[in-house]
Amino acid sequence: LEIKVNPPQDFEILDPGLLGYLYLQWKPPVVIEKFKGCTLEYELKYRNVDSDSWKTIITRNLIYKDGFDLNKGIEGKIRTHLSEHCTNGSEVQSPWIEASYGISDEGSLETKIQDMKCIYYNWQYLVCSWKPGKTVYSDTNYTMFFWYEGLDHALQCADYLQHDEKNVGCKLSNLDSSDYKDFFICVNGSSKLEPIRSSYTVFQLQNIVKPLPPEFLHISVENSIDIRMKWSTPGGPIPPRCYTYEIVIREDDISWESATDKNDMKLKRRANESEDLCFFVRCKVNIYCADDGIWSEWSEEECWEGYTGPDSK
């Protein structure tokens, strides 16, 4: 006799208004009498509709939460698993039950903002900027909302960057406990003449940090051939262990690059008689603190003052 189990009931994908953080929830299946003492597990698969691969979760819970790209639709499927001790060691699964979440198609794609860029400056404040949609009426204006785990609900930007009295960006500071978790943004718009398509963005703040450039550069030459360069980590909340540096050294007409995770470096001179010996440096958050980052601006150039020319004797 074939053992059968029903799929979960009421499987659905729910949008609680958190700009892409969705809830997938379901109810237990109707179970025949002989399996009522059994442990039920649920195999959940979900993805954005343009993705080739499913994320798979095995859980005993009745809800699962994750972040999605709301620019695209979402689909999920779930089935019940009966524990093997209930089924004489055989694997018993229900049929799949499916759910989907369709994106709003209000407003044409041309009304959606373009070139959304966000930078977390020195791990202190976030600046996002955008350009208006390709074809929008002159009365169109945009509004930015954001959410991350720890906020009760999505918040609107309170400090817009403006051009011609239109919102073209937003500055956010005091983002407490907002790194190392998904940060969700929605930019929607309004016009009296047409609906505006919303745009969704998700990232983690530590991956878009642009530090200040290193400062207090110093260069010296020891034994006439060993170049020693030092600099200070920029001020602010980024721990010194989180920086990686790129250094450009210029010796007369020759330049070369080097890299280090420390805030000093020793090199050999390429030519003993070089007259010009200078360097500059920039920094970025390293792989131990983030998956990605943005290079700082270059520091000012620092040159060795110790060389006084052939007539100095």
Epitope: N6, Q9, D10, E12, I13, L14, P16, Y23, Q25, K27, P28, P29, V30, V31, I32, E33, F35, K36, L40, I63, A99
Partner: antibody
Framework: EVQLLESGGGLVQPGGSLRLSCAAS????????MSWVRQAPGKGLEWVSY????????YYADSVKGRFTISRDNSKNTLYLQMNSLRAEDTAVYYC???????????????WGQGTLVTVSS | DIQMTQSPSSLSASVGDRVTITCRAS??????LNWYQQKPGKAPKLLIY???SLQSGVPSRFSGSGSGTDFTLTISSLQPEDFATYYC?????????FGQGTKLEIK
């Protein structure tokens, strides 16, 4: 404390419309399916409609199918019942009730509102 | 639709009595059966779910049993506040149905 408070009942003529509301508090609204159950004067309980937590699933009794629409606004913690083409036999006290499930799928109505009276009469 | 039939339709009893109300389903509903109590002018109150599970806060003198098509609600020792109408409800189908009710009156 779980609370359900119905409103929107009243006197309406046959063929008319009415929208009932049920304001919920004291629980995570989106996690629960919700039902409407009615009771005609001096009669027993009759289940009317059910909606799942996210609103994706709706079910109706045959007696109201095509005339009544159940909906919910999870941002407002509110359940609705839009009643169109009302008939004299729809006269009843309408209760909203929260649906819960046992771990093996047994569905039951564990909290009820106090009800709102709908009278359909000319 | 699954039909639910309760018996008796009404019943007289005294405080301290043991009372049993039965409910029969028109087809097997496993143990997907709930019992509710309703007092005049009040909303129904859940007593028993899944045939035999006592709802939180309900006195232990109430108990439920049965499976398949035949179910019983038992009140082991009637208290004055127990005089009310009792309804069974099947929850197997996505279209739940109630029994017609059993009115429990003071003898």
């Amino acid at each position: 404390e779980v609370q359900l408070l119905e409103s929107g009942g009243g006197l309406v003529q046959p063929g008319g419309s009415l929208r009932l509301s049920c304001a919920a508090s004291g629980f995570t609204f989106y996690s629960y399916g919700m039902s409407w159950v009615r009771q005609a004067p001096g009669k027993g309980l009759e289940w009317v409609s059910y909606i799942s937590g996210g609103g994706s699933y709706t079910y109706y009794a045959d007696s109201v199918k095509g005339r009544f629409t159940i909906s919910r606004d999870n941002s407002k913690n509110t359940l609705y019942l839009q009643m169109n083409s009302l008939r004299a036999e729809d006269t009843a006290v309408y209760y909203c009730a929260r649906g819960s499930y046992s771990h093996y799928g047994a569905h039951y109505l564990d909290y009820w509102g106090q009800g709102t009276l709908v009278t359909v009469s000319s | 639709d699954i039909q639910m039939t309760q018996s008796p339709s009404s019943l007289s009893a005294s405080v301290g009595d043991r009372v049993t109300i039965t409910c029969r389903a028109s087809q097997s509903i496993s143990s997907y059966l709930n019992w509710y109590q309703q007092k005049p002018g009040k909303a129904p109150k859940l007593l028993i779910y899944a045939a035999s599970s006592l709802q939180s806060g309900v006195p232990s003198r109430f108990s439920g049993s049965g499976s398949g098509t035949d179910f019983t609600l038992t009140i082991s020792s009637l208290q004055p506040e127990d005089f009310a109408t009792y309804y069974c409800q099947q929850a197997l189908s996505s279209l739940p149905t109630f029994g017609q009710g059993t009115k429990l009156e003071i003898k």
